[in-house]
């Protein structure tokens, strides 16, 4: 008994395709070893047609593939364009010849079925319309016209001239004649079902003078789409249903035992599992739509099936398009945490990843919202202003060339939780979904600046502390000048060499800023936080006013912000650091400048891809002027 | 509501033939896939046949221990499908089980590969 299985009787009809399933034991050998599709010659011989090891004889040639999944220990051999010299005995098997493990298959391609000479044949899709043209001669322009569909006995009238209309075809079936045409008249049958596939006759006038024609009606159901996907990257389901449903509520739905579970329509229905990953998208008039997922699950694969009804629901009848979608395990996506925890007023920093082969590319954050059809308006981007509500909060740093950049945000609110997308103008199979959660803060922040209302006086020096625990003793301490293209790190130097120290005092770890002399360009945010490598990790925000010396003058706090600016107890682990390069302004900051919106997310590669450094940096900071002392007591 | 239902099954003599069939009702779409599994008492449920419908090829499978004594049949469009069974003998005793689908993804072989399931009609050899 051969440990290979699969179809054993195989039928076609010419100018069709098959696709042969071959199942194969579940072992590393198998999973890495040569399939091949071989047809046996009478003298037991069998003779390579297509193998895994990229082979394809002449008469396969531009016709036939042979993919293997081995996530699903199949391979499958897609075979169009038959004809009946296909027919024959073949074998589907695995191992370096053709005389390893193998199972026989017999493939039988028929001639498309004979009908009626003047049989006009019509293939239509599940759901679609079909109009029949029906000619007849003059002298049967008074006579009754009339369709009827042949069962085993009879034929079943469908329409007439006489407005009779059989039961199942009410409201579907219209017989019409065309302006002064008087030699032809039309049945149109909408929302095709199985039921209606068949023979049909056209007649008019009645007895052996009549006008008849053999129709054959073909109602196909659309053949799935098959989409291989890996494990947390995102999928695009691109819906094309037709002008006729253009005006019609749109799904995707998902087969289930004994209905398809909609995902998501556009009447503001979601199902919670894509809660955070989902978003359906009108493209155009022309009925079409798409539906993106991200962050794929293994749980997310199966059969998903897209269509259009007043109900927003699968209707019979109803134009569909389905695929089958499955997740490959083996994911050349990282594995990161899919919830990151923060707290109030605290800070977490996000680890995106992007495919390492387009470190060029633009990256974006964004802040997934459900509401109406599901949308992402872009907050930060690599060449995209922050949003104006996270000014001084929010900040993007790329590190081209190793996979990942990281967001961070901080001054944290309960408001900030949610879901929040990385994605890129790139490979958009590297969209991932992060779900931020924010719990009211129960203990003092990590990171501490002083003094809190900080207003430093032109020309002066100021100095600014930031406070933090021994647990990020050996970590490096930064300070960095925020401005809506991101955060540019201070340059730094320590006041003398580390020494190794056995006890840490809690009390007296600082790094401290200082502006010397302060300048106007010094007023705005700046941010404490500790990083190691590329590792971001906490963050701590404070606004400093920049104001002229006035007699008796007394520092007014410019915001209450700074009194927030207080640090998440976890942080996200990341690999990435700062681009120091200073960024020029960008005038026309895309791919979301207008709305700042992911509305078209498929249709990514059109955008304006603006010039300029990724990595933020303020043209304005003066660093000479900007000394960054670590002082350790 | 989805129903498969089974018929034919019957006592019969070793090396005669049976027909079963299996009509499935309630559904809105055609199915793609439709098999029979049998149980003979105290074992697991096994394979029998299947056949697979795609646009208008057809896919029959069938376990070593049938090939060439059953066969398979259907239409997909009326959602119905035989079992033509030949040269029966004591071993091919049980419960004959109607599975079906509506698309053709997974091992044919595994009973989690269909969604619908019949009652099962029982087919009794006799020496």
């Known amino acids: 008994k051969s440990p290979i299985f699969g179809p054993q009787e195989v039928s076609s009809i010419e100018g069709d395709s098959v696709s042969i399933t071959c199942y194969y034991p579940d072992t590393s050998v198998n999973r890495h070893t040569r399939k091949y599709w071989c047809r046996q010659g009478a003298s037991g011989m069998c003779t390579t047609l297509i193998s895994s090891n990229g082979y394809l004889s002449k008469e396969y040639s531009g016709r036939a593939n042979l993919i293997n999944f081995p996530e699903n220990n199949t391979f499958v051999i897609n075979i169009e364009q038959l004809t009946q010299d296909d027919t024959g005995s073949y074998k589907c098997g695995l191992g370096t010849s053709n005389r390893g493990l193998s199972f026989d298959v017999s493939l039988e391609v028929s001639q498309v079925p004979e009908l009626p000479s003047d049989t006009h044949v019509y293939t239509k899709d599940i759901g679609r319309n079909v109009t029949i043209e029906c000619p007849f001669k003059r002298e049967n322009a008074p006579s009754k016209k009339s369709l009827c569909k042949k069962t085993n006995q009879s034929c079943e009238l469908v329409i007439d001239s006489t407005e009779k209309v059989n039961p199942s075809y009410i409201g579907r079936a219209k017989l019409f004649m065309k302006g002064t045409d008087l030699t032809v008249f039309y049945v149109n049958i909408s929302h095709l079902t199985h039921n209606d596939a068949g023979l049909y006759i056209c007649q008019a006038g009645e007895g052996p003078s009549a006008d008849k024609k053999n129709v054959d009606l073909q109602v196909l159901a659309p053949e799935p789409e098959l989409l291989y996907k890996d494990l947390r990257s995102s999928v695009t389901f691109e819906c094309d249903l037709g002008r006729e449903v253009a005006n019609e509520a749109k799904y995707l739905c998902r087969m289930n035992k004994e209905t398809c579970d909609v995902i998501i329509n556009t009447l503001g229905k979601r199902d919670p599992d894509f809660e955070g990953r989902i978003l359906i998208t009108p493209k155009d008039d022309n009925g079409r739509f798409s539906v993106l997922i991200t962050g794929l699950r293994k749980e997310d694969a199966g059969h998903y099936q897209c269509g259009a009804h007043s109900s927003g629901l699968p209707q019979e009848g109803w134009p569909i398009q389905t695929w089958q979608l499955f997740v490959n395990e083996e994911s050349t996506i990282p594995n990161r945490r899919s919830v990151v925890k923060g707290v109030t007023g605290g800070s977490v920093a996000i680890a995106c990843p992007y495919n390492p082969k387009e470190s060029s590319s633009l990256k974006y954050w964004c802040r997934w919202e459900g509401d109406g059809n599901g949308h992402c308006p872009v907050l930060v981007g690599t060449q995209a202003q922050v949003q104006e509500e996270y000014e001084g909060r929010l900040a993007l740093f790329d590190q081209p060339g190793n996979g990942t950049y990281t967001v961070i945000l901080n001054q944290l609110t309960t408001e900030d939780a949610g879901f929040y997308w990385c994605l890129t103008n790139g490979d958009s199979r590297w969209r991932t979904t992060i779900e931020l959660q924010v719990a009211e803060a129960t203990r003092e922040p990590n990171l501490e600046v002083t003094p809190q209302n900080a207003t430093a006086v032109l020309g002066e020096t100021f100095t600014v502390s930031c406070h933090y625990p021994c647990k990020f003793y050996s970590q490096e301490k930064y300070w960095c000048k925020w401005s809506n293209k991101g955060c540019h790190i201070l340059p730094s130097h320590d006041e003398g060499a580390r020494q190794s120290s056995v006890s840490c005092d809690q009390s007296s770890q600082l790094v401290s800023m200082t502006l010397n002399p302060v300048s106007k360009e010094d007023e705005g945010w700046y941010w404490c936080g500790v990083k190691q490598g590329q590792t971001y990790g906490e963050t701590t925000a404070i606004y400093i006013a920049v104001e002229e010396r006035t007699r008796g003058s007394s520092h007014v706090n410019p915001t209450d912000a700074n009194a927030r600016a207080k640090v998440a107890l976890e942080e996200e682990v990341v690999d990435s650091s700062i681009s120091e390069k200073e960024n020029k302004a960008i005038p026309n900051p895309g791919p979301f400048a207008n709305e700042r919106e992911i509305q078209n997310v498929g249709d990514q590669a059109q955008e304006n891809r603006a010039s300029g450094d990724a990595g933020s940096a303020d043209g304005q900071s003066r660093s000479s002027s900007s000394k960054h002392h670590h002082h350790h007591h | 509501e989805v129903q498969l239902v089974e018929s034919g099954g019957g006592v019969v003599q070793a090396e005669d033939s049976l027909r079963l069939s299996c009509a499935a009702s309630?559904?809105?779409?055609?199915?793609?896939?439709m098999g029979w599994f049998r149980q003979a008492p105290g074992k697991e449920r096994e394979f029998v046949a299947t056949?697979?419908?795609?646009?208008?090829?057809?896919?029959?499978y069938y376990d070593d221990s049938v090939k060439g004594r059953f066969a398979v049949s259907g239409d997909n469009t009326k959602n119905t499908m035989n079992l033509q069974m030949k040269g029966l003998n004591l071993e091919d005793t049980g419960v004959y089980y109607c599975?079906?689908?509506?698309?053709?993804?997974?091992?044919?072989?595994?009973?989690?590969?269909?969604?619908?399931w019949g009652q099962g009609t029982q087919v009794t050899v006799s020496s």
């Open positions: 056949i697979e419908w795609s646009g208008r090829s057809t896919y029959k």
């Open positions: 599975a079906a689908n509506p698309n053709n993804y997974g091992d044919p072989r595994t009973p989690g590969a269909y969604q619908y």
């Open positions: 309630g559904l809105s779409f055609s199915l793609s896939r």
